[in-house]
């Protein structure tokens, strides 16, 4: 399987809400001993590998923001903790999973990563991630609503498999 990021750049005005999205592509093993761990975190475009470093999103770590379930089941994070920080991550039955950030500030600008770990118990973990940039703008040059930019055609799915 792979992870696609439909949009590689989100440009939003301060105070707006935004939903960053990743999509699980390809066959998903729904076997008894296969489970999926999905999460979100901030990172940087590191010299070694993008999305390697895991930084908190609004003081919530990737451990706090994870989704746990098997296959394409729907899931969402612990509501109380995340919602107190204006965050909610969720997953549907079609392989889409997202994080919603409310009331954006300039401090929210940066690189965001989604991580999917396919856990094959007794064998190994297979991890894939997607990266996207969020730019929060203020002032007269800021858009009135979020503007999203699709991933470029040559890597239209902005896929990284590890």
């Amino acid at each position: 399987f792979k992870v696609a990021t439909p949009y590689s750049l989100y440009v939003c005005p301060e105070g707006q809400n935004v939903t960053l999205t990743c999509r699980l592509l390809g066959p998903v093993d729904k076997g008894h001993d296969v489970t999926f761990y999905k999460t979100w975190y901030r990172s940087s475009r590191g010299e070694v590998q993008t999305c390697s470093e895991r930084r908190p999103i609004r003081n919530l770590t990737f451990q706090d923001l994870h989704l746990h379930h098997g296959g394409h089941q729907a899931a969402n994070t612990s509501h109380d903790l995340a919602q107190r920080h204006g965050l909610e991550s969720a997953s549907d039955h079609h392989g889409n999973f997202s994080i919603t950030m409310r009331n954006l500030t300039l401090l929210d600008s940066g690189l965001y990563c989604c991580l999917v770990v396919e856990i094959r118990h007794h064998h190994s973990e297979h991890r894939v991630h997607g990266a996207m940039e969020l730019q929060v703008q203020t002032g007269k040059d800021a858009p009135s609503n979020c503007v999203v930019y699709p991933s470029s055609s040559q890597d239209s799915e902005n896929i990284t498999a590890a």
Epitope: H121, H123, S124, E125, R127
Partner: antibody, heavy 117, light 107 residues
Framework: QVQLQESGPGLVKPSETLSLTCTVS????????WSWIRQPPGKGLEWIGY???????NYNPSLKSRVTISVDTSKSQFSLKLSSVTAADTAVYYC???????????WGQGTMVIVSS | EIVLTQSPATLSLSPGERATLSCRAS??????LAWYQQKPGQAPRLLIY???NRATGIPARFSGSGSGTDFTLTISSLEPEDFAVYYC?????????FGGGTKVEIK
């Protein structure tokens, strides 16, 4: 802040079964891998196995025939049973939280188990 | 299973000196390697994950590098509290294994 606490007898007779429990406080046990790791006196660390929140288990092949790990989510506890113990099983036993694609980020303080008659 | 070999077994240094610890894997573990610190009578503490990323709260004097089969943990300037045993651990597959450890002792 998640904390782990091991409990169980500190002395077990050879050929008997070692039983330990780890209590998880300050967070949910309904996610992650919950692992057992041991360390014989003066030696290195050995991963024993884990139970995943879903109930899936995975054991070190070197111990698989003797190990059972179970979970009681209602009590926020997971347990280790190691059968047919010998003196070679004398060690400090740690429970730990293991995050998928990450590491053992939270450990119990460890409990010493001596196998002796 | 993957065997992790740490060297040296013991490193005798003075506070303020640079410590370089090695971990070699019997086969490639990509960059899926962690480092832990253990002090006498205590549980191990996570220092580095994915070969080169510091865990939360770990001082900048600790750094990790390497990929594939050869990895290094560097402590740029030893503080008194850094004298301990250090273990590497891979997570490319199961069983998870640890290296035998490197003891960093005061010279």
């Amino acid at each position: 802040q998640v904390q782990l606490q091991e409990s169980g007898p500190g002395l077990v007779k050879p050929s008997e079964t070692l039983s330990l429990t780890c209590t998880v406080s300050g967070g949910s046990i309904s996610s992650y891998y919950w692992s057992w790791i041991r360390q014989p006196p003066g030696k290195g660390l050995e991963w024993i196995g884990y139970i995943y929140y879903s109930g899936s288990t995975n054991y070190n092949p070197s111990l698989k025939s003797r190990v059972t790990i179970s979970v009681d989510t209602s009590k926020s506890q997971f347990s280790l049973k190691l059968s047919s113990v010998t003196a070679a099983d004398t060690a400090v036993y740690y429970c730990a939280r293991d995050i998928p694609a990450f590491a053992f980020d939270i450990w119990g303080q460890g409990t010493m188990v001596i196998v002796s008659s | 299973e993957i065997v992790l070999t740490q060297s040296p077994a013991t490193l005798s240094l003075s506070p303020g000196e640079r410590a370089t610890l090695s971990c070699r894997a019997s086969q490639s573990v990509s960059y899926y390697l962690a480092w832990y610190q253990q002090k006498p009578g205590q549980a191990p503490r996570l220092l580095i994950y994915d070969a080169f990323n510091r865990a939360t709260g770990i001082p900048a004097r600790f750094s990790g590098s390497g990929s594939g089969t050869d990895f290094t943990l560097t402590i740029s300037s030893l503080e008194p509290e850094d004298f301990a045993v250090y273990y590497c651990q891979h997570r490319i597959n199961w069983p998870l294994t640890f290296g035998g450890g490197t003891k960093v002792e005061i010279k």
